[in-house]
């Protein structure tokens, strides 16, 4: 229903902390290289509005739209063509243009610097002395370097973030208190990230049906017991609100969330035996718990599927009557048979079977020629199998750090034109699949692995659409969403590129990395190699594990050294005369 | 395949009402979006308001809130947009558009892959 005051409205239904929290996010994403205190002043002064909106929705603006009394806050403040150039003409636009135009400028890739996580006994300083500005900093750091993180979300890893810190700032070794419990939020923060920002992706590429699908897969699978009907109710809603947070609309998302979440619970007995334990969680915890609950045990009795999709005699009548009906109860039935599928696999399913349909429906005998429908499927899950197996057999050989490595050197060679940064970032971030996924049961290895090396995938597509430079990766990111990793996956080397020159300062390096942290020695040295491909591409595996073998014996020595300096110039030089031969 | 074609348009005074009409033929079906673009000489092509087939959601421009309604007839594949209070700077060609997929951003032309001819609507003070 439509309330006089829309910021009154959602301040009532979200409370102060949730709305003040919801707004910095919103801000913190628009406006990224803005500073903490510029956001907080703007939030409290949007805070102190809506109360006044909450005491007379009738006074003065409590009638606009939240986009234009946010907008107009943003658009306020001062050097703002100095500090983000263009984004500045969005100002000069109306509502909702304004708000698309802000939206179109956030930067997937911000100079930022990382977000360093202070020691122990200072940030346990800081957040005793202010809980709330310790928060409010978390939130716009994230946020601002992550400007599609799904705003509700955000909310929960803050709450997980005060909880750890309440617990751990009272132990007496708060540092190994902290740090696994902090490594672990930030791990589960960044994979959610790089989810949410494929669902926008998606969203903006290709549009609601595009996301629907995937939410009709992913819910059929994990509610089996769950009528069509249901199933299509949660994917409208899930729809509505992961659009209204990739639109900026956190406020309405989180609201609807809440009333998502609400619904759910009130409805466990049509949906899930599974939710009783999410659903006894205060609101935060009760959504997040919800959007990752196991899946309910699978109906006995459930016919096959090709009862109704093959062997009836009404398949293409049909079809033809409600094609988007047909096709969507094809793909909840499916999914709901194959929880062990990931959701790409299945709306591929889903494609080739409604392509089969409109070629044999057109026919002069229909049965026949789709009769072998199911057949056809075979190829396509071998596929993404034997990408599991293949993978998860190499990891387990390699370990996390050498299957990175593993990953990098294919991937360089897929796509040598891209930066060795960018590189170096996708190859970490697909090689964690291993120890993500590859340790689950065997029925969970293949949805972990698929879904989220589409995920990591989209990532590099959204990198490389700023500067398009590789025409593999062009080719792989202009399909559909479903279709890129199998393309990835079916890249070979780059035969039009033309090698780097081998350039000694490339690889020439200083006692400095010595004291480096384990995580950044090994981007220097994951650097190093993707530095070796780009120069000889066709290099065998073999002759690139002799040079990182010695490149690391040459590191560890000169780290061990008395005189480090000294070690590294003179021993350097060996190493780049040596790597050059062995690569020769 | 979908074909979009506008009429309704015309000269008016300031004050005045017109009701824009867009008849659209071919494949609509509950996913697609609809909308109103405007494009004055000399400027660039202006969103003014969306529906959606399926549900009914609209939008609009802030300058035409309250001024203009949109509104779909799904039984004749028709979508409408009542013009009040028609100003001189309401004056431009508009154009129907449809978006099959309702993308995510409801205001950029790029996102709608069906336009209609155009229709000239002049407003004179």
């Known amino acids: 229903e439509a309330h006089k005051s829309e910021i009154a409205h959602r301040y009532n239904d979200l409370g102060e902390q949730h709305f003040k929290g919801l707004v910095l996010i919103a801000f913190s994403q628009y406006l990224q290289k803005c500073s903490y205190d510029e956001h907080a002043k703007l939030v409290q002064e949007v805070t102190d509005f809506a109360k006044t909106c909450v005491a007379d929705e009738s006074a003065a603006n409590c009638d606009k739209s939240l986009h234009t009394l946010f907008g107009d806050k943003l658009c306020a403040i001062p050097n703002l063509r100095e500090n983000y150039g263009e984004l500045a003409d969005c100002c000069t636009k109306q509502e909702p243009e304004r708000n698309e135009c802000f939206l179109q400028h956030k930067d997937d890739n911000p100079s930022l610097p990382p977000f360093e996580r202070p020691e122990a006994e200072a940030m346990c300083t800081s957040f005793k002395e202010n809980p709330t500005t310790f928060m409010g900093h978390y939130l716009h750091e994230v946020a601002r370097r992550h400007p599609y993180f799904y705003a509700p979300e955000l909310l929960y890893y803050a709450e997980q973030y005060n909880e750890i810190l309440t617990q751990c700032c009272a132990e007496a070794d708060k540092e190994s208190c902290l740090t696994p419990k902090l490594d672990g939020v930030k791990e589960k923060a960044l994979v959610s990230s790089v989810r949410q920002r494929m669902k926008c992706s998606s969203m903006q590429k290709f549009g609601e049906r595009a996301f629907k699908a995937w939410a009709v897969a992913r819910l059929s699978q994990t509610f089996p017991n769950a009528d069509f009907a249901e199933i299509t109710k949660l994917a409208t809603d899930l729809t509505k609100v992961n659009k209204e947070c990739c639109h900026g609309d956190l406020l309405e998302c989180a609201d609807d969330r809440a009333e998502l979440a609400k619904y759910m619970c009130e409805n466990q007995a049509t949906i899930s035996s599974k939710l009783q334990t999410c659903c006894d969680k205060p609101l935060l915890k009760k959504a997040h718990c919800l959007s990752e609950v196991e899946h309910d045990t699978m109906p006995a009795d459930l016919p096959a599927i090709a009862a109704d999709f093959v062997e009836d005699q009404e398949v293409c009548k049909n079809y033809a009557e409600a094609k988007d009906v047909f096709l969507g109860t094809f793909l909840y039935e499916y999914s709901r048979r194959h929880p062990d599928y990931s959701v790409s696999l299945l709306l591929r399913l889903a494609k080739k079977y409604e392509a089969t349909l409109e070629k044999c429906c057109a026919e002069a005998n229909p049965p026949a020629c789709y009769g072998t429908v199911l057949a056809e499927f075979q190829p396509l899950v071998e596929e993404p199998k034997n990408l599991v197996k293949t993978n998860c057999d190499l990891y387990e050989k390699l370990g996390e750090y050498g299957f990175q490595n593993a990953i990098l050197v294919r991937y360089t060679q897929k796509a040598p034109q891209v930066s060795t940064p960018t590189l170096v970032e996708a190859a970490r971030n697909l090689g964690r699949v291993g120890t993500k996924c590859c340790t689950l049961p065997e029925d969970q290895r293949l949805p972990c692995v698929e879904d989220y090396l589409s995920a990591i995938l989209n990532r590099v597509c959204l990198l490389h659409e700023k500067t398009p430079v590789s025409e593999h990766v062009t080719k792989c990111c202009s399909g559909s969403l479903v279709e890129r990793r199998p393309c990835f996956s079916a890249l070979t080397v780059d035969e039009t590129y033309v090698p780097k020159e081998f350039k000694a300062e490339t690889f020439t390096f200083h006692s400095d990395i010595c004291t480096l942290p384990e995580k950044e020695k090994q981007i220097k040295k994951q650097t190093a190699l993707a530095e070796l491909v780009k120069h000889k591409p066709k290099a065998t595996a073999e002759q690139l594990k002799t040079v990182m073998d010695d490149f690391a014996q040459f590191l560890d020595t000169c780290c061990k050294a008395a005189d480090k300096d000294t070690c590294f110039s003179t021993e350097g030089p060996n190493l780049v005369t040596r790597c050059k031969d062995a690569l020769a | 395949e979908v074909q979009l074609v506008e009429f309704g348009g015309g000269l008016v005074q300031a004050g005045g009402s017109l009701r824009l009409s867009c008849a659209a033929s071919g494949r609509t079906d509950s996913a697609y979006r609809m909308g109103w673009f405007r494009q004055a000489p000399g400027k660039e092509r202006e969103f003014v308001s969306a529906?959606?087939?399926?549900?009914?959601?609209?939008v609009y421009l802030d300058s035409v809130k309250g001024r203009f309604t949109i509104s779909r007839d799904n039984a004749k594949n028709m979508v409408y947009l009542q013009m009040n209070s028609l100003k001189p700077e309401d004056t431009a060609v508009y154009y129907c558009?449809?978006?099959?997929?309702?993308?995510?951003?409801?205001?950029?032309?790029?996102?709608?892959?069906?336009w209609g001819q155009g229709t000239q609507v002049t407003v004179s003070s």
């Open positions: 558009a449809a978006d099959p997929d309702s993308r995510l951003y409801y205001t950029v032309p790029q996102n709608y892959d069906y």
């Open positions: 529906i959606n087939w399926s549900d009914g959601r609209t």
